[in-house]
Interface confidence: medium
Amino acid sequence: FERTRSLQDPCSNCPAGTFCDNNRNQICSPCPPNSFSSAGGQRTCDICRQCKGVFRTRKECSSTSNAECDCTPGFHCLGAGCSMCEQDCKQGQELTKKGCKDCCFGTFNDQKRGICRPWTNCSLDGKSVLVNGTKERDVVCGPSPADLSPGASSVTPPAPAREPGHSPQ
């Protein structure tokens, strides 16, 4: 399809950053202000993303690439390409429809985003609680009483739980 198009279509020669201007005998005109074309052969340029309100500009729009936004302090990105900004909470809290709420007893959140997660159940691994959990920190599991013999291994904290619903930034 692309080869056929280039044979028939003079616009296929217009590079990224331009559009093929039908009103000027199909010459390649630069994209208008605040617009871009990331592909060649376009008859129009795309509107640049505007980082307004809670969004701030991380990368300015150029004639060949869109602007990139991140969030103002106190907020963090969600979604592909930072499509949303969500309010930060303190460690030991989670964001609900009514705002930031403290983690319930038996749960913790060691980040400014995401949800409160249950403390690790040390007994499931046959271990005992060495350090109690808080709203901000998980419990630290220690060796079981049976392991407290000479040569027993040292304390092993639980593996950090992956936060659900968020890929690493």
């Epitope: 616009c11 009103n23 208008p32 990331s38 592909a39 129009t44 795309d46």
Partner: antibody, heavy 118, light 111 residues
Framework: QVQLQQSGAELARPGASVKMSCKAS????????MHWVKQRPGQGLEWIGY????????IYNQKFKDKATLTADKSSSTAYMQLSSLTSEDSAVYYC???????????WGAGTTVTVSS | DIVLTQSPASLAVSLGQRATISCRAS??????????MNWFQQKPGQPPKLLIY???NQGSGVPARFSGSGSGTDFSLNIHPMEEDDTAMYFC?????????FGGGTKLEIK
């Protein structure tokens, strides 16, 4: 001859969704952006948003961000708009319009009438 | 959002006379020397039709009696001489800033 052929009228219940189409012919579909515009009976025009069929890049009027979803199928040269959670406020004629280089709508579809009624 | 205010809301003009429709923007729609202002004509039961783009450029196949002028925040559409076929609604539209917006429309009739 450049044409945008829109799908037929839709009658829908409140809360339902509708998906309308806009089939392009007479030009290379992927090289022009496709915009959508709403017109309520006897009222003005409202810009909903647009899609670039090549990159599938979309921009929405914030007012319609949770109402409209724009998609495009390059293989059939067709743009689509889905409207969700319909209310009587969504009863209107919806136009697709091709965007010319200096950001003007040079070709319009005939419109799809959506009627929301219980 | 940029608000476009058209005046008058309705207008009756004699055949052969001049019709002038104004469109005022709440902020400038100019950028780097380009005015992102367009004018459309709409007849009952039909989609809008492009008349003028970038404030003063005629759309393809548009008769020479339609002309546009203005920059910044103040724009006008002139129709001279008025013909019977010109009875319609006329809308201005800006494409400088998202969301793109339209004026409320002017109804033009024969006097």
């Amino acid at each position: 001859q450049v044409q945008l052929q829109q799908s037929g009228a839709e009658l829908a219940r409140p809360g339902a969704s509708v998906k309308m189409s806009c089939k392009a012919s007479g030009y290379i579909f992927t090289t022009y952006a496709m915009h959508w515009v709403k017109q309520r009976p006897g009222q003005g025009l409202e810009w909903i948003g647009y899609i670039n069929p090549t990159t599938v890049y979309t921009i929405y009027n914030q007012k319609f961000k949770d109402k409209a979803t724009l998609t495009a199928d390059k293989s059939s040269s067709t743009a689509y708009m889905q409207l969700s959670s319909l209310t009587s406020e969504d009863s209107a004629v919806y136009y697709c319009a091709r965007l010319g280089g200096h950001w003007y709508f040079d070709v319009w579809g005939a419109g799809t009438t959506v009627t929301v009624s219980s | 959002d940029i608000v476009l205010t058209q005046s008058p809301a309705s207008l009756a003009v004699s055949l052969g006379q001049r019709a002038t429709i104004s469109c005022r923007a709440s902020e400038s729609v100019d950028n780097y020397g380009i005015s992102f202002m367009n004018w459309f004509q709409q007849k009952p039961g039909q989609p809008p039709k492009l008349l003028i783009y970038s404030a003063s450029n005629q759309g393809s196949g548009v008769p020479a009696r339609f002309s546009g002028s203005g920059s910044g925040t103040d724009f006008s559409l002139n129709i001279h001489p008025m013909e019977e076929d010109d009875t319609a609604m006329y809308f201005c539209q800006q494409s400088k800033e998202v969301p793109w917006t339209f004026g409320g429309g002017t109804k033009l009739e024969i006097k």
